[in-house]
Interface confidence: low
Amino acid sequence: RAPRCRELPAQKWWHTGALYRIGDLQAFQGHGAGNLAGLKGRLDYLSSLKVKGLVLGPIHKNQKDDVAQTDLLQIDPNFGSKEDFDSLLQSAKKKSIRVILDLTPNYRGENSWFSTQVDTVATKVKDALEFWLQAGVDGFQVRDIENLKDASSFLAEWQNITKGFSEDRLLIAGTNSSDLQQILSLLESNKDLLLTSSYLSDSGSTGEHTKSLVTQYLNATGNRWCSWSLSQARLLTSFLPAQLLRLYQLMLFTLPGTPVFSYGDEIGLDAAALPGQPMEAPVMLWDESSFPDIPGAVSANMTVKGQSEDPGSLLSLFRRLSDQRSKERSLLHGDFHAFSAGPGLFSYIRHWDQNERFLVVLNFGDVGLSAGLQASDLPASASLPAKADLLLSTQPGREEGSPLELERLKLEPHEGLLLRFPYAA
């Protein structure tokens, strides 16, 4: 008799793929544009990335450090009108893109939560949640919660409002903290909260350390749903050298949880390569004319246009990973098992019941390595086959689809492999 199928877990929309943050509308659109109407015109691009949600803003009225002149119910006219926002919501819905609104109050000021009048601000947030839920947003983000006194209790209250409206609504909290204990204390009192933090930002570039951080986090959080990013707002290039971007894309898309990216992560947007651009929100490079300040500073392969047509680009890799992440059961909600593969390497299996299984092998090192996959670390339910098919490599030149003998696996410096193999009873 065939074995019984394992019951599928309840899947919320944010479990099914990546979130894409656009914190600065003007930088994202460039050319002095930067409003909600213009963003609507970029939704097809977001669709092509196969992201599930857009984390937008903040876009509310905020006079720097002035509580009285901060109105979370009003859109800053520089960004457009409530009608523009409604139109964006409708268009996004048609394209199956959810919209999450950032309500971090004092986003133009020194302290995101103002240094005093915490209760006044908290009340404003509460009113804003109810207002924007009625307007049709799919969730909210609040950042810098380490600056919010009694953050846990406020988050619990806001979570209740959000979930009370619909279980299908999401609350994201962001913190600059990378301390696991602080992160866990925020999570403990808030069951469905999605938390972005700097936890992985100091993973350095060793496979062992990254493996240790990931496994510690997963063990500590138990069965709760995680999110994966390197910070609450900043670009991957703020933390990583260019040669590790592909590796991290592969890792973030294949760990169990929701990957969260900032605009530009998909092309390796790097403020350091654009003189005069702010580190936290450089202009998005749609094409070579996006940064006219210094002629020749931008080459085609740094842009969306240039990378869109190149199957070997970071953007093409992002699209492929995003596609796999959103359609494979083992990547959507499969079990995770990390195991030893040798110094400098981080490897793990994702598997769900009798569905196709995935093996990820990541070489964080500067030298080519042979992988010694220690299958003895794995439970019987997740055993390794002798061969697996190469689904993709972060490096060009691999024959995709070819079967690789796992005993003879060799990885180039900074190479990541995603391999697939069938369930075997």
Epitope: Y45, K50, V304, G306, E309
Partner: antibody, heavy 122, light 113 residues
Amino acid sequence: QVQLKESGPGLVQPSQTLSLTCAVSGFSLSNYGVIWVRQPPGKGLEWMAVIWTNGNTNYNSTLKSRLSISRDTSKSQVYLKMNSLQTEDTATYYCARHYYDGTYYYGYFDYWGQGVMVTVSS
Amino acid sequence: DIVMTQTPSSQAVSAGEKVTMSCKSSQSLLYTENKKNYLAWYQQKPGQSPKLLIYWASTRESGVPDRFMGSGSGTDFTLTISSVQAEDLAVYYCQQYYYFPYMFGAGTKLELK
């Protein structure tokens, strides 16, 4: 208006190298990718290679070891070299332009050259 | 690589007749988030180069007569010519552009009865 025109030898000896040129006008190679496709007599279309606007290339895996695609943007020309020709490489060779909608490239081809017939025979 | 299978390989028709031809792909060409099918149809008349007819499975290229209609989704697609004209006698190819490398079908040849 947009035009692509292939040129090359009509006859090539077996084991020799084929060199083809695709001259384009009405658009820039800095903005569009160009592909080569071939069609043996009475048979279907086979995608061979592409050169993208950044100069990156991709090849049909079955022909990869024998192919080389390149371009000269200033001359608006794309070149295809294919070595170790055999009689089964007898075909009409076309170049075509990748579709581009201003933001994103899609893998269908809106303009084609008229083709050049290449016979491999001794 | 994706395999594109076209049927029939040839079809004899009379002018004014309605014609349908099929194209099946070995993997789905539908991306559910934008609800688009990454499939194109080309027409190749004798002695000529292929000409783009339809993209996104059902969008006619400008200048293509409205008697040509593309339909289908996922793995099964159809090209219909509502009333065949003499100038429509040609080979019709489907092509997927969802996955790299882009693959063509073997073609359906339209001939006069």
